[in-house]
């Protein structure tokens, strides 16, 4: 398939509740009606799939399988949120976008967003 540019932020810090959000923007060369978005995690040269979604332009994202991701779409932007993150999940999260209909199919892979996750300190015991 043909190449397409995908932009995403370089760094994001997850919240204390283990939630990280970032925008994945793609330069659509045509009038795609069906889009797939996959989030990949790269750590120690290993690449694993975090979640995947498919949607019709103008409709809500449908995340596939039991997903830790949620998101919304607006034009050529996808707002992604990953939940349940812990310190061990720190890594490079890559946004992959595929325009699946109509042909020609396009594929774009972002440079990745480094997500830092810091586990919150446990609350000290309180004497009341």
């Amino acid at each position: 398939c043909k190449a397409m540019h995908v932009a995403q932020p370089a760094v994001v810090l997850a919240s204390s509740r283990g939630i990280a959000s970032f925008v994945c923007e793609y330069a659509s060369p045509g009038k795609a009606t069906e889009v797939r978005v996959t989030v990949l995690r790269q750590a120690d040269s290993q690449v694993t799939e975090v979640c995947a979604a498919t949607y019709m332009m103008g409709n809500e994202l449908t995340f596939l399988d039991d997903s830790i991701c949620t998101g919304t779409s607006s034009g050529n932007q996808v707002n992604l949120t990953i939940q349940g993150l812990r310190a061990m999940d720190t890594g490079l999260y890559i946004c992959k976008v595929e325009l699946m209909y109509p042909p020609p199919y396009y594929l774009g892979i972002g440079n990745g967003t480094q997500i830092y996750v810091i586990d919150p300190e446990p609350c000290p015991d309180s004497d009341f």
Partner: antibody, heavy 123, light 107 residues
């Protein structure tokens, strides 16, 4: 009823080209992608590429890029697959098959197939 | 490219037997999978799409299941007309590759 009728068998010399046609009837030609798949004798199925008859948009399997050319004629509801620089390993049955209705998520299914066209490449 | 590994490559079974064919993808294909039946000299015929949805007019003895990378086609009670070769195909990322096929023969 939906029908995809392909052109007849061809015998070609190595280095030459072949053009296979696929005439669609029984549905709106521009509402469905047309895919091409081939099958060498006694072997499995191999996806060649896809064309959207409405827009002319095409995606090829990288393996065939530069050698395969897909076209579609809306006026006659006919799709074509041309393969150039033929070699003996291109001897196969070539199928056209339609996929899904326009713009329907999850409609990933090749539901109707042509009868196949045997292309024999031999010196 | 996503590799589709089908097993077994062939099997012998009797009429009435329960037959299971598996297809493993080299990465998660999220149920974007179809199964086809092919008889000698004929074009493939759609059996199942979206991993588990039966095609129009396909007998209910055929069923598809699975998720992620592992998928199964089951024939609950093999009939004489079911002796054929079966192929899986993914629709996740192009090229949309097929499995190598499973030939179901009469025992």
């Amino acid at each position: 009823q939906v029908q995809l009728v392909q052109s007849g068998a061809e015998v070609k010399k190595p280095g030459s080209s072949v053009k296979v046609s696929c005439k669609a009837s029984g549905y709106t030609f521009t509402d469905y992608e047309m895919h091409w798949v081939r099958q060498a004798p006694g072997q499995g199925l191999e996806w060649i590429g896809v064309i959207d008859p409405e827009t002319g948009g095409i995606t090829y399997n990288q393996k065939f890029k530069g050698r395969a050319t897909l076209t579609a004629d809306k006026s006659t509801s006919t799709a074509y697959m041309e393969l150039s620089s033929l070699r003996s390993e291109d001897t196969a049955v070539y199928y056209c098959t339609r996929r899904g209705a326009r713009a329907t998520v999850y409609n990933y299914v090749m539901d109707y197939w042509g009868q196949g066209t045997l292309v024999t490449v031999s010196s | 490219d996503i590799q589709m590994t089908q097993s077994p490559s062939s099997l012998s079974a009797s009429v009435g037997d329960r037959v299971t064919i598996t297809c493993r993808a080299s990465e998660n294909i999220h149920n974007y999978l179809a199964w086809y039946q092919q008889k000698p000299g004929k074009a493939p015929k759609l059996l199942v799409y979206n991993a588990k949805t039966l095609g129009d007019g396909v007998p209910s003895r055929f069923s598809g299941s699975g998720s992620g990378t592992d998928y199964t086609l089951t024939i609950s009670s093999l009939q004489p007309e079911d002796f054929a070769t079966y192929y899986c195909q993914h629709f996740w990322s192009t090229p949309w590759t097929f499995g190598g096929g499973t030939k179901v023969e009469i025992k």
